[in-house]
Interface confidence: low
């Protein structure tokens, strides 16, 4: 039985504080009382806590604990969210500028083929861009297409300019001639090369930083148990109760309540630093074919090797696809 | 080589990009969040630290609070006391994570995975076969000028030289965080949190 | 110093012919874009017409297509604008301009116009 | 023919902030600004939606966002009083100006 309170002890600094943590509930005592009900601050003496009080002691804790870890980790949150827009807006930037810059290849070197051209580049490089937002494509088909939609273009305007506008017939067998015929030579290989080891770099990179947002997240709104809100109550709420305001925890105290707290949260450690580290990898490899922005601005100028490389072999090539689409082509005249 | 027709004003050796040396590329850009995200790397290891730091806690007072009752601030009650007769501590500790923490970790461990193996040297045979195809020089290894693959010895050096930055309306200096200037920190309003 | 001059404006009836000229020095002439750009009295700018640096490219305003004709001499440093059937519209400032190119050397389409002539005026009144 | 348009007039006091709208650019282009001062050339200003050439004031600013640009204006001085273009590029990459804004410093 714990010694009676001094006659003229009251509540009322108690009372004062509680007020502001739940203003204009009666729960506070006006004396202290033995407190035979406290089942988290148990009482060594009269206490000026009631059930109830205790109940709200533990829920402001555990809030205060929710939001000592957002603002632990605000500045981490900011950098990787800011970072992520960032490098989505300048991913889809380089996009656009590798976009107009082959645009203006065209039309500053083969001003015949542009209407098209620019119709053909601006869905590979659309392309391009969903890629890299994760879009289920795959680049070796986008650079196909690429190159499957400019030859009939090529043919008939560059290489075959007495022809009548082209017919699908015509198109058909020029599309299946470029590839069969390799007219572009190695180009499109190494593009397909450059262009999906880039992207796939850049694809990665996006999602990590995508990932690393959810980590902090989820680690950000962890609700806490039970448990440890009665820890939490204990060592920031329980002196209150005797009437010890100005009291503060012992620092080696609050660590051993943190740690029991963030048990969970923190064998996410080993992993995090591994990201971090892996991530780090990752960018010191970005560079020359695993560099998007290096890649997609120079597209421009290898495609324009490419279309020199087929008007290299115009010849040739206008003699082998006479024969090979001399059917379509006769379909066509008639 | 391939020949470039005059109005690409191409530079046979060095395509010459008039751009300043300290505008931040793309490539630089990545490296500064590397270096700022390492000094986060024991971020989970340290929660529990930064937290305390973060709330009151008796720092140069004489007597402290351990759970139970007031006591020296360098006594061994300090720390032990107040986790007598209490629940088991190691017992929330055997917990184990939450199922939201347990699900996130299978995540880091799978970008982890394929980070690695998007690093890996081993998945970087390309550069040789490229070079065996006559596409790529080997004389591009500088920091700052990189490669692109022209055609067999036309090889053309181009600077990294989006100058991204200067299109996006961010600005990434932690100092302006907003977390900087948060209001309802437990620091910035501890009457509604800690009386101190 | 970087520098553009035309010459060549007047008066002149509709229906007539003008040549403009624009010399330039103080940059590679060869290696840029030039573009002509007007401005009728009291209005805005218009662009009118722009040639690649070899000269093989040509491009013009609707409203000059078929009548102007832009070309230039890289070994003179200078750029043209042979300007035929005029009309009382075309009365104007006629500015030559250099393409501004920061990146890409080549890139002289989208950049803007770093360098401008002080302008030649164009008249076409009966 | 794409059409950039721009407010006619613009003011604001010495020493205020101003900005200058430009809307309808929508090929992808980047927008340039030109500062026109009486009776003289246009003069390139920001290009590339909000880089200055060397010599232009930090006072003046550029910047982008979707289908308009805007030129932010810090400090005003008389010496700023002028017509002010925003350009940009049509689909077939041929130049194309806004209407003009006269900005007065009152």
């Known amino acids: 039985q714990p010694p009676p309170p001094p006659p003229d002890a009251t509540c009322h600094q108690v009372r004062s504080f509680f007020q502001r943590l739940q203003p204009g509930l009666k729960w506070v005592p006006e004396t202290p009382v033995p407190g035979s009900d406290l089942q988290v601050c148990l009482p060594k003496g009269p206490t000026c806590c009631s059930r109830k009080m205790e109940e709200k002691y533990q829920l402001t804790a555990r809030l205060n604990m929710e939001q000592l870890l957002q603002s632990a980790s605000m500045e981490l949150k900011f950098l990787i969210i800011q970072n992520a827009a960032v490098f989505q807006e300048a991913f889809e930037i380089v996009v656009r500028h590798a976009k107009n810059y082959t645009n203006a290849m065209f039309k500053n070197n083969y001003p015949s083929l542009t209407p098209q051209a620019f119709e053909f580049v601006g869905e590979f490089f659309t392309d391009v861009s969903l890629y890299i937002l994760g879009s289920d494509i795959n680049v070796d088909d986008m650079v196909n297409e690429l190159f499957d939609s400019l030859f009939p273009v090529i043919y008939t305007q560059l290489m075959n300019p007495g022809l009548p506008d082209s017919a699908l017939d015509i198109n058909e067998c020029l599309r299946g001639a470029r590839r069969d015929l390799k007219v572009f030579g190695n180009f499109p290989k190494l593009i397909m090369t450059q262009v999906s080891k880039s992207l796939q770099v850049t694809r990665i990179f996006l999602q990590a930083l995508n990932l690393g947002i959810e980590v902090i997240n989820t680690t950000d709104h962890l609700k806490f148990s039970k448990d440890c809100g009665r820890m939490l109550t204990r060592m920031w709420y329980c002196s209150y109760c005797q009437g010890l305001m100005m009291v503060k925890p012992c620092g080696g105290y609050c660590n051993v309540v943190m740690q029991g707290c963030m048990a969970g949260v923190v064998e996410i450690d080993k992993y995090w630093r591994e990201y971090i580290l892996s991530l780090e990898e990752l960018v010191n490899g970005m560079y020359r074919i695993y560099d998007m922005e290096n890649v997609l601005l120079g597209l421009f100028s290898t495609i324009h090797d490419s279309i020199q490389y087929v008007q290299k072999n115009a010849g040739k090539l206008t003699t082998t696809i006479g024969k090979l689409c001399a059917h379509s082509q006769q379909r066509q005249y008639r | 080589s391939a020949y470039y027709p005059e109005d690409l004003f191409i530079d046979k050796k060095v395509l010459k990009v008039a751009h300043v040396e300290h505008e931040e590329t793309l490539s630089s850009r990545r490296r500064e969040l590397i270096q700022k995200l390492k000094s986060f790397i024991s971020f989970y290891s340290a929660l529990p630290g930064y937290i305390c730091s973060h709330s009151p806690v008796a720092e140069n007072d004489t007597l402290c609070w351990n759970g139970q009752e007031l006591v020296e601030r360098y006594s061994q009650k300090a720390a032990r006391n107040g986790m007598k007769n209490q629940f088991n501590l190691h017992e929330l500790k055997m917990k184990g994570p939450e199922p939201v923490v347990s699900q996130i970790i299978d995540k880091l461990k799978h970008i982890n995975q394929l980070l690695r193996t998007m690093s890996m040297p081993k998945g970087r045979v390309l550069d040789k076969n490229l070079d065996e195809e006559g596409f790529e020089s080997g004389d591009c290894g500088d920091d700052e000028d990189e490669c692109i693959g022209g055609s067999g010895d036309g090889m053309i050096k181009v600077k990294n030289q989006l100058r991204f930055l200067a299109e996006l309306a961010y600005d990434l200096d932690v100092d302006d965080a907003p977390g900087n200037s948060q209001q309802a920190t437990p620091k910035d309003n501890e009457i509604s949190t800690f009386h101190n | 110093e970087v520098q553009l001059v035309e010459s060549g404006g007047g008066l002149v009836q509709p229906g007539g012919s003008l040549r403009l000229s624009c010399a330039a020095s103080g940059f590679t002439f060869k290696r840029y874009a030039m573009s002509w750009v007007r401005q009728a009295p009291g209005k805005g700018l218009e662009w009118v017409s722009s040639v690649s640096s070899s000269g093989t490219g040509t491009y013009y305003a609707d409203s000059v297509k078929g009548r102007f004709t832009i070309s230039r001499d890289n070994s003179k440093n200078t750029l043209y604008l042979q300007m035929n059937s005029l009309r009382a519209e075309d009365t104007a400032v006629y500015y030559c301009?250099?393409?501004?190119?920061?990146?890409?050397?080549?890139?002289?389409?989208?950049?803007?116009?770093?360098?401008w002539g002080q302008g030649t005026t164009v008249t076409v009144s009966s | 023919q794409s059409v950039l348009t721009q407010p006619p007039s613009v003011s604001g006091a010495p020493g205020q902030r101003v900005t200058i709208s430009c809307t309808g650019s929508s090929s992808g282009y980047d927008v340039h600004w030109y500062q026109q001062l009486p009776g003289r050339a246009p003069k390139l200003l920001i290009y590339?939606?909000?880089n200055r050439p060397s010599g232009v004031p930090d006072r003046f600013s550029g910047s982008n966002s979707g289908t308009s640009a805007s030129l932010a204006i810090t400090g005003l001085q008389a010496e700023d009083e002028a017509d002010y273009y925003c350009?940009?590029?049509?689909?077939?990459?041929?130049?194309?100006f806004g209407g003009g804004t006269k900005l007065t410093v009152l």
């Open positions: 590339g939606s909000n």
């Open positions: 301009a250099k393409e501004y190119d920061y990146g890409l050397g080549w890139m002289h389409y989208y950049y803007g116009m770093d360098v």
């Open positions: 350009q940009s590029y049509d689909s077939s990459l041929n130049a194309i």
